[in-house]
């Protein structure tokens, strides 16, 4: 299911990098979140629960990431103009069932003031 544009601030700039915020419902217990740049998978994070509610976090394509109870943040560093693109949060929900996939995204604009290490 494609949801289209994120209805929240998806990009947060700091120190020449960007935090890309991928939100999900806090009812969701087990999921995979992928960050797509165009159609390419940049990062992913999978959260599963084992017996005794032990939480497991795995990444096949590792990026610096941060997990909360309703979002995954992926961090991109050393921004340059090539980072300008459409970025999508591709959420696959395993628990609660049934399995659902939802895609939200937005365009990352790169302005001179946000670039890393710009010449003064």
């Amino acid at each position: 299911e494609i949801n289209g544009s994120a209805n929240y601030e998806m990009f947060i700039f700091h120190n020449g990098g960007v935090q890309i915020l991928c939100k999900y419902p806090d009812i969701v217990q087990q999921f995979k979140m992928q960050l797509l740049k165009g159609g390419q998978i940049l990062c992913d994070l999978t959260k599963t629960k084992g017996s005794g509610n032990t939480v497991s976090i795995k990444s096949l394509k590792f990026c610096h990431s941060q997990l909360s109870n309703n979002s995954v943040s992926f961090f991109l560093y050393n921004l340059d103009h090539s980072h300008a693109n459409y970025y999508f949060c591709n959420l696959s929900i395993f628990d609660p069932p049934p399995f659902k996939v939802t895609l939200t995204g937005g365009y990352l604009h790169i302005y001179e003031s946000q670039l890393c290490c710009q010449l003064k």
């Epitope: 949801n3 209805n7 939100k23 419902p25 009812i27 969701v28 609660p96 069932p97 659902k100 939802t102």
Partner: antibody, heavy 125, light 108 residues
């Protein structure tokens, strides 16, 4: 008018098999998760099995390993293959559908808002 | 498995009276609760989803409330066609999806 029509019920001996079908019309079948719910005469409702829009399947413990749910979206059809039937499987079987929509941080569940009229399965020798 | 308990098992009231039906869950199901009405020989009909949202075509005299573990279905002024069996149902902690045992609403 939204319609679900079940068929395939009947009398079968213990250990036998039946295949139930459910034909849908007038709604977007492939956007619905579909379920089979059964009811013994004079008793309450019991969930049997479900299949998600992605084809993921779920079963109650009482039918796991004996029943198989499937769907054919191109034909707007839902099926329940019932094997190794027991007397305890005797009931009216309803097909029903519900929807879950995820929007950002929101998880919406809209309930089982479409139901068929039911088909009767009797397991007896 | 989430166990749903409904009470009373039977409720005897007259047309025009207010009916209050209760459903209790064995664990927190937030607001993911639905109510159904079933008449003899008919399939169940969805009345309420998300604990408090009326389904399409359901009269305003039906209302739902509650969250967590305690839920209520209220019929503000009973019509003759409202006498039936009412079931609550959860579909957030599953499988299995579970239904309550039902409350029979009968004419006094």
């Amino acid at each position: 008018e939204v319609r679900l029509v079940e068929s395939g019920g009947g009398l079968v001996q213990p250990g036998g098999s039946l295949r139930l079908s459910c034909a849908a019309s007038e709604f977007i079948f492939n956007s619905y998760d579909m379920h089979w719910v059964r009811q013994v005469t004079g008793k309450g409702l019991e969930w049997v099995s479900a299949i998600g829009t992605a084809g993921d399947t779920y079963y109650s413990d009482s039918v796991k390993g004996r029943f198989t749910i499937s769907r054919e979206d191109a034909r707007n059809s839902l099926y329940l293959q019932m094997n190794s039937l027991r007397a305890g499987d005797t009931a009216v079987y309803y097909c029903t559908g519900d929807r879950t929509v995820v929007r950002g941080v929101n998880y919406y569940y809209f309930g089982m808002d479409v139901w068929g009229q039911g088909t009767t399965v009797t397991v007896a020798s | 498995e989430v166990v749903l308990t409904q009470f009373p098992a039977t409720l005897s009231l007259s047309p025009g009276e207010r009916a209050t039906l209760s459903c209790r869950a064995s664990q927190n199901i937030r607001s993911y609760l639905a109510w159904f009405q079933q008449k003899p020989g008919q399939a169940p009909r969805l009345l309420i989803y998300g604990a408090s949202n009326r389904a399409t075509g359901i009269p305003a005299r039906f209302s739902g409330s509650g969250s967590g573990t305690d839920f209520t279905l209220t019929i503000s002024s009973l019509e003759p066609e409202d006498f039936a069996v009412y079931y609550c149902q959860q579909r957030i902690n599953w499988p299995p999806i579970t239904f309550g045992p039902g409350t029979r609403l009968e004419i006094k």
